[in-house]
């Protein structure tokens, strides 16, 4: 069955997928799709690479790692509950039926906010979940707290940076990896 990964609403979700190129720069096409891997290709493609570059992507979906070294892990920006589901990472190795397919289950949960002890102003109305997030580790809490002169975009960016660094560290070692060549 699928490996399950979790994120909270407003975070950037990270779905790990790796392969080892036969030689540096000798890349293999990869596709990411929403939905379980079909017999061929990816359904509902959200991102695709070819032998040289990322040649197709949709908003909020990107590769954060070095895909030229085989890190084709998918980052989904600013997730909502509707981003939950099965995602397919398909490494399209040349030859008949040689593709490696990985189904990853992404479960998004409502974000949990610890009330900041100091004044919060009114930006909680637009981003009620952005001020404080509870992390994935045991008893881990990351607090942005009182931010007197900062706009919503900065709050969102700062929150995502905190989350991304944590998620990448937490999940990088648990991803699907194959060696080619």
């Amino acid at each position: 069955s699928e490996v399950e990964y979790r994120a909270e609403v407003g975070q950037n979700a990270y779905l790990p997928c790796f392969y080892t190129p036969a030689a540096p720069g000798n890349l293999v096409p990869v596709c990411w799709g929403k939905g379980a891997c079909p017999v061929f290709e990816c359904g509902n493609v959200v991102l695709r690479t070819d032998e040289r570059d990322v040649n197709y992507w949709t908003s909020r979906y990107w590769l954060n790692g070095d895909f030229r070294k085989g890190d084709v892990s998918l980052t989904i920006e600013n997730v909502t509950l509707a981003d939950s589901g099965i995602y397919c990472c398909r490494i399209q190795i040349p030859g008949i039926m040689n593709d490696e397919k990985f189904n990853l289950k992404l479960v998004i949960k409502p974000a949990k906010v610890t009330p900041a002890p100091t004044r919060q102003r009114d930006f909680t109305a637009a981003f009620p979940r952005m001020l404080t997030t509870r992390g994935h580790g045991p008893a881990e809490t990351q607090t942005l707290g009182s931010l007197p002169d900062i706009n919503l975009t900065q709050i969102s960016t700062l929150a995502n940076e905190l989350r991304d660094s944590r998620l990448a560290n937490d999940l990088r070692d648990s991803g699907a990896t194959i060696r080619i060549g």
Epitope: T80, L81, A82, S84, G85, V107, K109, P110, K112, P128
Partner: antibody, heavy 119, light 107 residues
Framework: QGQLQQPGAEVVKPGAAVKLSCKAS????????MQWIKQRPGQGLEWIGE????????DYNQNFKGKATLTVDTSSSTAYLQLSSLTSEDSAVYYC????????????WGPGTLVTVSS | DILMTQSPSSMSVSLGDTVSIICHAS??????IGWLQQKPGKSFKGLIY???NLEDGVPSRFSGSGSGADYSLTISSLESEDFADYYC?????????FGGGTKLEIK
Amino acid sequence: QGQLQQPGAEVVKPGAAVKLSCKASGYTFTSYWMQWIKQRPGQGLEWIGEIDPSDNYTDYNQNFKGKATLTVDTSSSTAYLQLSSLTSEDSAVYYCAREGAFSSPFAYWGPGTLVTVSS
Amino acid sequence: DILMTQSPSSMSVSLGDTVSIICHASQDIRSNIGWLQQKPGKSFKGLIYHGTNLEDGVPSRFSGSGSGADYSLTISSLESEDFADYYCVQYVQFPRTFGGGTKLEIK
């Protein structure tokens, strides 16, 4: 998918409080958030709030803050909605609903409890 | 709060018909929408989640579509058990908010 059981009806006096129960069975209670919803005839549906049974974390509709309190008892796999200072406006059917496997918040519903506030 | 405007409020249809119910959100809700069914005097059943996905056990004659702020529930080849009230609900933002409902009646 499991089941959610709620008592059929509660009659309470104005000014009193009532604690409504929603007993879960057939699934892992602490794995899924629970929602509470109010339905009044001709008034549509109102979301009251949600609770994560794994750690008692709650989110409330601001319109129900001070009126509603959500709790859980994991030992009996039961979620509770307490309503305080009841008035005739609180007479309604109250439903619990739990999320589904892919974070669908309103996947499975209890049968609802009819609360009647009457002296 | 996000306002969910559902239409029509009621419709009379015949067995075997195909019907669509529309929900318009007051802002982009990014497919964070569910569709619910309530039979007279009964509780609710989840039909569709995340805009297009069928809840477990829901017949394939139900389907959901849409994006941005506009979504629809379509029921093809109506059966007698489909005559009920239908509601949409958004969950992209707090508080969760519901449409006003659509009553499907037999013509």
